[in-house]
């Protein structure tokens, strides 16, 4: 899992998260999101 460290006063970890679209609807394929500081963003 990729993590990136920012050169600031504190660390913010980014992590790519992958979900299957059919788990949340009728589409197929994958949905890729990014978790930043524990919050998943699109």
């Amino acid at each position: 899992d990729a993590e990136f460290r920012h050169d600031s006063g504190y660390e913010v970890h980014h992590q790519k998260l992958v979900f299957f679209a059919e788990d949340v609807g009728s589409n197929k394929g994958a949905i890729i999101g990014l978790m930043v500081g524990g919050v998943v963003i699109a």
């Epitope: 899992d1 992590q15 998260l17 979900f19 299957f20 679209a21 059919e22 788990d23 197929k28 994958a30």
Partner: nanobody
Framework: EVQLLESGGGLVQPGGSLRLSCAAS????????MGWFRQAPGKGREFVAA????????YYADSVKGRFTISRDNSKNTVYLQMNSLRPEDTAVYYC?????????????????WGQGTLVTVSS
């Protein structure tokens, strides 16, 4: 939860192929997205590939895309990993895991059940 048992590992030459199988016991197999991870000596467990509950959707790590194919047969409660064009860096213990729907399929923490692993060695 499901119980998982991997098979099909072994020694193969670079450029060769292997097919791993993961047999699941339990009636709830098609409630789970299924994934393969691998762990090389001295390294962490890394995501390889995953297949959705229906088998319609798949996702691969960049390192295996175009070489590995994941599939499942829900009538046999089995997941497969077809590995072609194998490289020495593919040497690892390969683990099958089950992740409940709606969880991220590329991270280890989403997987609630694991098999015991099967060793794949790629060497001439």
């Amino acid at each position: 939860e499901v119980q998982l048992l991997e098979s099909g590992g072994g020694l193969v030459q670079p450029g060769g192929s292997l097919r791993l199988s993961c047999a699941a016991s339990g009636r709830t197999f098609n409630n789970y997205n299924m994934g393969w991870f691998r762990q090389a000596p001295g390294k962490g467990r890394e995501f390889v590939a995953a297949v959705s509950r229906s088998g319609v959707s798949t996702y691969y790590a960049d390192s295996v895309k175009g070489r590995f194919t994941i599939s499942r047969d829900n009538s046999k409660n089995t997941v497969y990993l077809q590995m072609n064009s194998l490289r020495p860096e593919d040497t690892a213990v390969y683990y099958c895991g089950a992740a409940y729907r709606g969880t991220a399929i590329n991270v280890r923490r989403s997987y609630s059940s694991w098999g015991q692993g099967t060793l794949v060695t790629v060497s001439s």
